[in-house]
């Protein structure tokens, strides 16, 4: 079955029952994605605006999908599983009486059964399991996944130490002279570098040793956190943001509506899902995509993909790859890579790398 | 490449009955819901009925519950629809269309066939 | 029941025309509305998902926007290959369906 292509996902309250405090909800509902990102390498992050991975909706009878609530008692809740659109989603029946207790339908019971139907998870038969099909009050204060419901869920996902990469459970800001330091996406944005990372960038501007952190949803609420590519037409004050499939164009520093669209719009063939890293050369008028070890290279005038393409990242920038995190352009002759920890200035009129740096170099550590 | 491909239609009197199918390629058939949708001639589109990756669930629209059996069979790669007690409103186009896989249909149909024509006539 | 009243059932444009197909639902049904483009003879095909995602292989100046009860279709500048019907959909619910022809 389906899982996320991804560590780090978005979730949203839809609308809150009025059977408990807002509070509650959104207490119970951390908890219990909490709950699994105990075992796991996931990482949820609760945003307002925008769209979310995982939507969490409360409501009764029919409510646009094909499966509508029976009123009180029977199905209490359903989710989907990983994917688009109403993949991952949560609903929960608004005829249930929602509690914070066990009268009534304890809610961080019944998310933490759904949640992991929106992570892949299906039924368990071992009645001590979550996701064994019937509900059951325990006493959360105690509560614990079975071994069955966690040998599940690291069987679609691995184990809490497989996620060196994404060391901020708690979406804390990461600490920027950390020598192990990575980067979700770079890009410039006229005279500033914007460096990305889970729910943050930080802003860098030329030639000045100051850097700022700033949530990313402070500056565009309607844009999601784990921003994975990002490069700027500077010509037209243009940024181009990506996620997952989707892009979002930011002009003159304010989103433009109908957006996010598909990164398939762009030409690129379905197998691909993300993109890795992106940089605009004005030179050349080209704009680079990397997805995993291969490249695109698209033309921004024509609006098409060149012919030819992927190549090998490995084969073209030599001593760069075979996959990188981020990437930009500097000084009308630089493109700076990031791989992990480690950045490369690279001369691409030279074609080679001319010098090897931490990637948090920018910020006088 | 994905394809669906129905079969089955063709011109049957008022109470008669037929069987649609649809025979699917370039994917792994299993995991997915799969969809009839019909298309009266000059009409729109009418959702008729949906079954679960596993086929244990089956959902139809009100105005074909009790006449029409959804099936299909995993190991053929085949989705079938059993329509019994025609009538006349019932002469359609019949696409079948593929849905997200996983325990829930979502009525995303992001593949459809070309569709077979049914007619009930006397 | 949820209903999807769509407008307007037809359309005259022409080519290089900004278009605009709304749909409403009766009751909030979220994101969870798609668009599908069908030409005469020819099964329908999937333009956006999830009220705003342009599905794959769908040009750009396809977008789609809304959430809960109010949701549209906008096609930026009219191709050719454009000129079809156009239908919203949730679930097991179809609009009407909206006739885009030359003017």
């Known amino acids: 079955g389906p899982v996320w292509r991804k560590h780090y996902i978005t979730y949203r309250i839809n609308n809150y029952t009025p059977d408990m405090n807002r509070e509650d909800v959104d207490y119970a509902i951390r908890k219990a994605f909490q709950v699994w990102s105990n075992v796991t390498p996931l990482k949820f992050s609760k945003i307002n605006t925008g769209m979310a991975d995982i939507l969490v909706v409360f409501a009764r009878g029919a409510h646009g999908d094909f499966h509508a609530f029976d009123g009180k008692g029977g199905i209490l809740a359903h989710a989907f599983g990983p994917g688009s659109g109403i993949g991952g989603d949560a609903h929960f029946d608004e005829d249930e009486f929602w509690t914070t207790h066990s009268g009534g339908t304890n809610l961080f019971l019944t998310a933490v059964h759904e949640i992991g139907h929106s992570l892949g998870l299906g039924h368990s038969s071992d009645p001590k399991a979550v996701m064994f099909p019937t509900y059951k009050y325990v006493d959360i204060n105690t509560f614990r996944l079975s071994a069955d419901d966690i040998r599940g869920i690291q069987s679609l996902y691995g184990d809490p130490k497989e996620n060196q990469r994404l060391p901020n459970p708690d979406n804390s800001e990461p600490a920027l002279c950390d020598p192990n330091l990575s980067f979700d996406a770079v890009t410039t944005v006229g005279n500033k570098i914007f460096f990305f990372k889970d729910r943050f960038f930080w802003l860098k501007v030329s030639e000045r040793p100051k850097t700022s952190v700033n949530l990313i949803s402070s500056l565009w609420p309607t844009l999601p956190s784990g921003i994975e590519a990002a490069y700027e037409i500077e010509a037209r004050n243009q940024v181009f943001l990506f996620k997952d499939d989707k892009y979002w164009l930011i002009s003159n520093l304010r989103p433009e509506p109908n957006y996010p669209k598909s990164i398939h719009s762009f030409g690129f063939p379905n197998f691909v899902k993300k993109i890795d890293a992106a940089v605009f050369n004005p030179r050349f008028y080209r704009t680079y995509f990397f997805v995993d070890n291969q490249y695109w290279r698209y033309d921004e005038r024509r609006q098409m993909m060149d012919p030819g393409y992927p190549k090998l990242i490995t084969k073209n920038f030599q001593g760069i790859g075979p996959k990188i995190d981020a990437v930009f352009y500097s000084k009308n002759k630089y493109y700076y890579f990031f791989q992990g920890s480690n950045q490369f200035e690279y001369d691409f009129l030279l074609q080679r790398i001319t010098k090897t740096l931490k990637s948090n170099s920018w910020f006088g550590c | 490449e994905v394809q669906l491909l129905e079969s089955g239609g063709g011109l049957v009197q008022p109470g008669g009955s037929l069987r649609l199918s649809c025979a699917a390629s370039?994917?792994?058939?299993?995991?997915?819901?799969m969809h009839w949708v019909r298309q009266a001639p000059g009409k729109g589109l009418e959702w008729v009925s949906g079954i679960s990756p596993s086929g244990g669930e089956t959902i139809y629209a009100d105005s074909v519950k009790g006449r029409f059996t959804i099936s299909r069979d995993n190991s053929k790669n085949t989705l079938y629809l059993q329509m019994n007690s025609l009538r006349a409103e019932d002469t359609a186009v019949y696409y079948c269309?593929?849905?997200?896989?996983?325990?829930?249909?979502?009525?995303?149909?992001?593949?459809w066939g070309r569709g077979t024509l049914v007619t009930v006539s006397s | 029941d949820i209903q999807m009243t769509q407008s307007p059932s037809s359309l005259s444009a022409s080519v290089g025309d900004r278009v605009t197909i709304t749909c409403r639902a009766n009751?909030?049904?979220?994101?969870?509305l798609n668009w599908y483009q069908q030409k005469p003879g020819k099964a329908p095909e999937l333009l956006i998902y999830a009220a705003s995602s342009l599905q794959s292989g769908v040009p750009s100046r396809f977008s789609g926007s809304g959430s809960g009860t109010d949701f549209t279709l906008t096609i930026s500048s009219l191709q050719p290959e454009d000129f079809a019907t156009y239908y919203c959909?949730?679930?097991?619910?179809f609009g009407q369906g909206t006739k885009l022809e030359i003017k």
């Open positions: 269309a593929r849905d997200i896989w996983g325990a829930y249909a979502s009525g995303l149909f992001d593949y």
């Open positions: 009751q909030s049904i979220y994101t969870y």
């Open positions: 370039g994917f792994t058939f299993s995991p997915y819901w």
């Open positions: 959909q949730q679930a097991g619910i």
